[in-house]
């Protein structure tokens, strides 16, 4: 029963985590204008992996996509790649883990196959979570590095010297969503791997029967197992998986508007 719960919980935690990774990847607020340094501007800048946005105090928000691919910093490309790899691995992991769930019967699938699938999905979730955490951490490091620089625009760059107000960027909501989501996916993956250990088919154990022959005693373990002298058994007990429940994750919304007034 504990293995069932572990597998089911691992699946749900991973599902929430991957939903969070997808949300973080799509969010515009990876970096937000540092208002502590410059709270008097009537314009609020924030940037994501795919576009940058400007919110005016009048309420008008304008977002522009990064239409160049070659013009983007290698670090940003790396973060995008890590997040996409994390999503892809997580999605495949979810697909595999659905079929690995003990409560779902697909034909005459062996328990050993389910155990292998659980382990595979667990590893995928772990790698997915690590990719997300790495991606978010690389971006955070990029922000910290650039914090004290007065940059015209972190991504699009500006040809020539253009006089602008120093706009410094700090951690946006997406970074925290990404870190938490990556952590959840990682935890879910670990839980799936733990569940896998208890999912392997149990070897049939019989109690040793003692036969007294002339002059000496030998203990036999019927069923093709190797005999051992004495009556001590060293076979490990296996928990039997008896099914579990699965829950659906709800879609989360992220309030991400910055209101000036």
């Amino acid at each position: 029963m504990a293995v069932t719960a572990c597998q089911g919980l691992g699946f749900v935690v991973s599902l929430i985590g991957i939903a969070g990774i997808i949300a973080a990847t799509c969010m515009d607020q990876w970096s937000t204008q540092d208002l502590y340094n410059n709270p008097v501007t009537a314009v609020f800048n924030y940037q994501g992996l795919w576009r940058s946005c400007v919110r005016e105090s009048s309420g008008f928000t304008e977002c522009r996509g990064y239409f160049t691919l070659l013009g983007l910093p290698a670090m940003l490309q790396a973060v995008r790649a890590l997040m996409i790899v994390g999503i892809v691995l997580g999605a495949i992991g979810l697909l595999v883990s659905i079929f690995a769930l003990k409560c779902i019967r697909i034909g005459s699938m062996e328990d050993s196959a389910k155990a292998n699938m659980t382990l595979t999905s667990g590893i995928m979730f772990i790698v997915s979570g690590l990719c997300a955490i790495a991606g978010v951490s690389v971006f955070a490091n990029m922000l910290v590095t650039n914090f004290w620089m007065s940059t015209a625009n972190m991504y699009t760059g500006m040809g020539g010297m253009v006089q602008t107000v120093q706009t410094r960027y700090t951690f946006g909501a997406a970074l925290f969503v990404g870190w938490v989501a990556g952590g959840l996916t990682l935890i879910g993956g670990v839980m799936m791997c733990i569940a896998c250990r208890g999912l392997a088919p149990e070897e049939t154990n019989y109690k040793a029967v003692s036969y007294h022959a002339s002059g000496h005693s030998v203990a036999y373990k019927p069923g093709g197992f190797k005999a051992s002298t004495g009556f001590g058994s060293n076979t490990k007990n296996k928990k039997i998986y008896d099914g579990g429940a699965r829950t659906e994750d709800e879609v989360q919304s992220y309030p991400s508007k910055h209101d000036y007034v």
Epitope: V40, A42, N45, C53, V54, S58, E62, N153, V261
Partner: antibody, heavy 117, light 113 residues
Framework: VQLQESGAELVRPGTSVKVSCKAS????????IEWIKQRPGQGLEWIGM????????KYNEKFKGKASLTADKTSSTAYMQLSSLTSDDSAVYFC???????????WGQGTLVTVSA | DIMMTQSPLSLTVTAGEKVTMTCKSS????????????LTWYQQKPGQPPKLLTY???TRESGVPTRFTGSGSATDFTLTISSVQAEDLAVYYC?????????FGGGTKLEIK
């Protein structure tokens, strides 16, 4: 879009006055209402803004304690109360609706406030 | 507060002439996030409230005649009237729309001969 301001006011020094600005022709809670002061024959001074949706305000430091901005969603009306009036407060007060680029896209006709003993 | 300096204080022109007035801000009004200049131009005719002409330094408000053109970047801005008409008699104000508190220039009074 129309912003209709209240009529001219003649007030005594030390008293207060409340100027109103009735909005019509658009969703009142979706746009900021800005207030601007213009002394006779002088330039323009920004007093502050109010978000009618949230009731949040932002003031020019110079007018903090002098002006108080409020808004009534049900009547689509913004108000500016001016307190402890002096002759320096004699001016035309405009309300305006915020627009793109933090501009003041639509203006009321203005309310003349005269502070005189 | 940001200082907005307009020049000239006044100018007298004949109808059909080209007019240029300038506005200088004490700090850059260029926002790095969208590379837009938060400078606005208004026209105020005698006895009327101001009327929006351009925002983002060069974007003409709908309904404003094409003879009005805003230009410039960072700290130096210009409003050009390509062919002045009699109805253009007014005071023209520039406004910092980037920093709080919003500040206006002293105005340029346009008079027609």
């Amino acid at each position: 879009v129309q912003l209709q301001e209240s009529g001219a006011e003649l007030v005594r020094p030390g008293t207060s006055v409340k100027v109103s600005c009735k909005a019509s022709g658009y969703a009142f809670t979706n746009y900021l209402i800005e207030w601007i002061k213009q002394r006779p024959g002088q330039g323009l001074e920004w007093i502050g803004m109010i978000n009618p949706g949230s009731g949040g305000t932002k003031y020019n430091e110079k007018f903090k304690g002098k002006a108080s901005l409020t808004a009534d969603k049900t009547s689509s009306t913004a108000y500016m109360q001016l307190s402890s009036l002096t002759s320096d407060d004699s001016a035309v007060y405009f309300c305006a609706r915020g627009g793109f680029g933090n501009s003041f896209a639509y203006w009321g006709q203005g309310t003349l406030v005269t502070v005189s003993a | 507060d940001i200082m907005m300096t307009q020049s000239p204080l006044s100018l007298t022109v004949t109808a059909g002439e080209k007019v240029t007035m300038t506005c200088k801000s004490s700090q850059s009004l260029l926002n790095s996030g969208n590379l837009k200049n938060y400078l606005t131009w208004y026209q105020q005719k005698p006895g009327q409230p101001p009327k929006l002409l351009t925002y983002w330094a060069s974007t003409r408000e709908s309904g404003v005649p094409t003879r009005f053109t805003g230009s410039g970047s960072a700290t130096d801005f210009t409003l050009t009237i390509s062919s002045v008409q009699a109805e253009d008699l007014a005071v023209y104000y520039c406004q910092n729309a980037y920093f709080y508190p919003y500040t206006f220039g002293g105005g340029t009074k346009l008079e027609i001969k």
